[in-house]
């Protein structure tokens, strides 16, 4: 026989059968108590008593950490980067001890004029923020240096920070195969070497959505998944709506267990409702159903 | 930084002699030094230019009257402008490379610091 546990006129009967008053505790949650001092509190899923509630560790909330949230915030950062360890030969400066003395007179002419070069080199690339010369050593002067690029995070970043960096390749490459010493003179504000142009490294912001809601969904790894809002990922489960991935309860209430979700069916005083997705209706005093 | 005041402009009538002197902050000794002008409505051009080793290079316009020199000791480029013309009317001012530039043989160059000017008229 159902066992029905009433809640005033509504109560809540799992899509496979049994009756349960919400708000629930999901027996099917790993349950770990914590006492701290004098104050015993059944702070689940390692949560831990504060002195005034339950400071319950994420996915879970509730007075008793019992209950998994629909939603975990993940973010993003603001803005995501590449450097670029690139090396390229100058032809026009003569190589000095100085140079290496980043206070020296040498150095400081020779940093603001090769930044003001590559400025104009990577003028068009709108993800270029500014070099920074990592080392200068002798050949006639070897400049080893970083081009830092930076773009604003969305789900395509990588892309659009790998094609700056072939564009940056693209530019460095020209610059460097026509600003070229001829008979000993160099009309530009500096010439290469162009055989010197070298692409030692490419280090790109790591940052995956998926993997971040994962981890935070702890063992409900499985059932929480990213879906984009004007480009912003959020971390879901089932249970919060408005997304694709959203499942419909109709006559229900969505709850997450480690099964994954499933809908607790509402039992009002005149119908039952049943069904995975409490779509089933049964009239209490005529026992047809009707969808 | 170094700054460079350019001195010895003025008005000159045509076919007389002028010479333009440029005092430098610092040490020009390796740096490639040149002389620019912008006449009133056009664009700036290089008139002269002298390497760090001393070797000179000039616009044609003004080759055989014009001859660029410098005393690294006084940190100072010159200009001599003889057989002036009334072409030559222009803002002059004097130009350096960075340190230890090489490769200045002309004067598509571009230098780095670069002085205020001083006016050279030449009219009769």
């Known amino acids: 026989p159902l066992a029905t546990i009433p809640v005033s006129t509504t109560s809540l009967t799992s899509s496979e059968g049994s009756t349960i008053s919400t708000p629930s505790v999901d027996i099917s949650t790993p349950v770990t108590t914590s006492i701290v001092g004098d104050q015993c509190s059944r702070c689940k899923n390692g949560g831990f008593w504060d002195g005034l509630k339950c400071q319950c560790l994420t996915p879970y909330y509730g007075e008793s950490c019992e209950e998994v949230v629909n939603s975990i915030d993940i973010a993003p950062p603001e803005t995501v980067s590449a450097q670029m360890e690139l090396t390229v030969t100058v032809t026009s400066v003569k190589f000095t001890d100085e140079l290496k003395n980043h206070s020296s007179q040498e150095f400081r002419e020779f940093n603001k004029t090769f930044t003001e070069q590559m400025n104009i080199v990577y003028s068009g690339i709108p993800e270029y923020v500014g070099v920074n010369i990592t080392n200068l050593r002798l050949g006639s002067v070897v400049v080893e240096h970083d081009v830092l690029l930076r773009t604003k995070y969305t789900p395509e970043y990588k892309t659009a920070l790998d094609n700056a960096t072939e564009v940056v390749k693209q530019k460095i490459t020209k610059v460097t195969t026509e600003q070229i010493m001829t008979n000993d003179n160099c009309s530009a504000l500096m010439c290469f070497n162009t055989t010197g142009t070298q692409v030692q490294n490419i280090t790109v912001t790591q940052y995956d959505p998926v993997e971040e809601c994962r981890q935070k969904a702890e063992e409900y790894e499985d059932y929480f998944l990213v879906e984009y809002r004007d480009q912003k990922p959020y971390c879901i489960s089932p249970c919060e709506s408005g997304f694709n991935a959203s499942k419909n309860c109709n006559h229900g209430k969505c709850q997450m267990s480690q099964n994954g979700a499933r809908c607790l069916c509402v039992t009002t005083e005149t119908h039952w409702y049943s069904g995975e997705d409490c779509n089933q209706g049964t009239q209490k005093s005529h026992h047809h159903h009707h969808h | 930084e170094v700054q460079l005041v350019e001195s010895g402009g003025g008005l000159v009538q045509p076919g007389r002699s002028l010479r333009l002197s440029c005092a430098a902050s610092g040490d020009i000794t390796r740096r490639c030094m040149g002389w620019f002008r912008q006449a009133p409505g056009k664009e700036r051009e290089g008139v002269a230019g002298?390497?760090?080793?001393?070797?000179?290079g000039y616009a044609d316009s003004v080759k055989g009257r014009f001859t660029i020199s410098k005393d690294n000791a006084k940190n100072s480029l010159y200009l001599q402008m003889n057989s002036l013309r009334a072409e030559d009317t222009a803002l002059y001012s004097c130009?350096?490379?960075?340190?230890?530039?090489?490769?200045?043989?002309?004067?598509?160059?571009?230098?780095?610091?670069r002085g205020q000017g001083t006016m050279v008229t030449v009219s009769s």
């Open positions: 130009a350096a490379s960075i340190l230890n530039r090489v490769g200045c043989r002309q004067l598509s160059y571009e230098y780095i610091y």
């Open positions: 002298i390497s760090e080793d001393g070797i000179t």
